[in-house]
């Protein structure tokens, strides 16, 4: 059941990113570190970089509430066992600052791409009977 809940949470994050993509014009047009083509076993490290990024509502009024709620939900921390498991074999993942900085639209697209990749990895690890999650 924990595995299922974990997968639901990851897919929920994908939906949150999708919702935020509707509001890119209401986000502060700041350039943010946006990992891309993340190396195997560095997915959780890159995920953490996305979560740490200062994505912000431009406070332009109408959609401010849903944007702020969504951003806060994107920062929900997964249990450290999940975050640590895939990285146990690799100690040297790139620092957040080393990733190319992108505006909110591309930042969200890259975040979604990483979440999709992690979702597929999780599915395949379950199919092959691995305990990784």
């Amino acid at each position: 059941q924990g595995q299922d809940r974990h997968m639901i949470r990851m897919r929920q994050l994908i939906d949150i990113v999708d919702q935020l993509k509707n509001y890119v014009n209401d986000l502060v047009p700041e350039f943010l570190p946006a990992p891309e083509d993340v190396e195997t076993n560095c997915e959780w490290s890159a995920f953490s970089c996305f979560q740490k990024a200062q994505l912000k509502s431009a406070n332009t009024g109408n959609n401010e509430r849903i944007i702020n709620v969504s951003i806060k939900k994107l920062k929900r921390k997964p249990p450290s066992t999940n975050a640590g498991r895939r990285q146990k074999h690799r100690l040297t993942c790139p620092s957040c600052d080393s990733y190319e900085k992108k505006p909110p639209k591309e930042f969200l697209e890259r975040f979604k791409s990483l979440l999709d990749k992690m979702d597929h990895q999780h599915l395949s690890s379950r199919t092959h009977g691995s305990e990784d999650s």
Partner: antibody
Framework: QVQLVESGGGVVQPGRSLRLSCAAS????????MHWVRQAPGKGLEWVAF????????YYADSVKGRFTISRDNSKNTLYLQMNSLRAEDTAVYYC???????????????????WGQGTTVTVSS | EIVLTQSPGTLSLSPGERATLSCRAS???????LAWYQQKPGQAPRLLIY???SRATGIPDRFSGSGSGTDFTLTISRLEPEDFAVYYC???????FGQGTKVEIK
């Protein structure tokens, strides 16, 4: 069982204040965001306010902003709504509702209000 | 802010018939963010559907939700006497409700 019980409603004059309470039981209150929703007589549902599970963020409908304050005491499993400068248009049944998206990664994940109280009636009249 | 428009305002049907309720959003809504509630007279609302199509705990399978983007639908496949009530859609996050659709006995 999971339960929310509102109290504190009553008849109050315009411009006066009232504090509503919502007692939660049967679940880990401190891991859920909470809402107040109201319903004027014969009307639809109107969301009023939301507070994050740990009280770190609060959101309000424009119609109550600056007049109403949502708060919570996790040690008492209780949600509050302080209503100041009450107006006739605040007359309604006030419901507290649990946000279905738990802060726990492995907890409930519903994007909706999954548990509701029975409501308490507030009448603002001179 | 997003506006949710429900139609029809009232639906007059007989028990056993199929009910189709519509909820249209003024801007695109991620399906995870769309919920449906049922409210009977003198009672609190009850969560029926979350994530546009997932039934909440204890909700019978005659209730189903569908849709994406700006158009969402709640379908009751065969109306039971206890289904006659008011139904509301809601966007999560802004927590805006639609104005409601009343399903009444014909």
């Amino acid at each position: 069982q999971v339960q929310l019980v509102e109290s504190g409603g009553g008849v109050v004059q315009p411009g006066r204040s009232l504090r509503l309470s919502c007692a939660a039981s049967g679940f880990t209150f401190s891991t859920y965001g909470m809402h107040w929703v109201r319903q004027a007589p014969g009307k639809g549902l109107e969301w009023v306010a939301f507070i994050w599970y740990d009280g770190s963020d609060k959101y309000y409908a424009d119609s109550v902003k600056g007049r109403f304050t949502i708060s919570r005491d996790n040690s008492k499993n209780t949600l509050y709504l302080q209503m100041n400068s009450l107006r006739a248009e605040d007359t309604a049944v006030y419901y507290c509702a649990r946000d279905g998206d738990s802060s726990d990664w492995y907890g409930d994940y519903y994007f909706g209000m999954d548990v509701w109280g029975q409501g308490t009636t507030v009448t603002v009249s001179s | 802010e997003i506006v949710l428009t429900q139609s029809p305002g009232t639906l007059s049907l007989s028990p056993g018939e199929r009910a189709t309720l519509s909820c249209r959003a003024s801007q695109s809504v991620s399906s995870s963010y769309l919920a449906w509630y049922q409210q009977k007279p003198g009672q609190a609302p009850r969560l029926l559907i979350y994530g546009a199509s997932s039934r909440a705990t204890g909700i019978p399978d005659r209730f189903s939700g569908s849709g994406s983007g700006t158009d969402f639908t709640l379908t009751i496949s065969r109306l039971e006497p206890e289904d006659f009530a008011v139904y509301y859609c809601q966007q999560y996050g802004s927590w805006t409700f639609g104005q409601g659709t009343k399903v009444e006995i014909k």
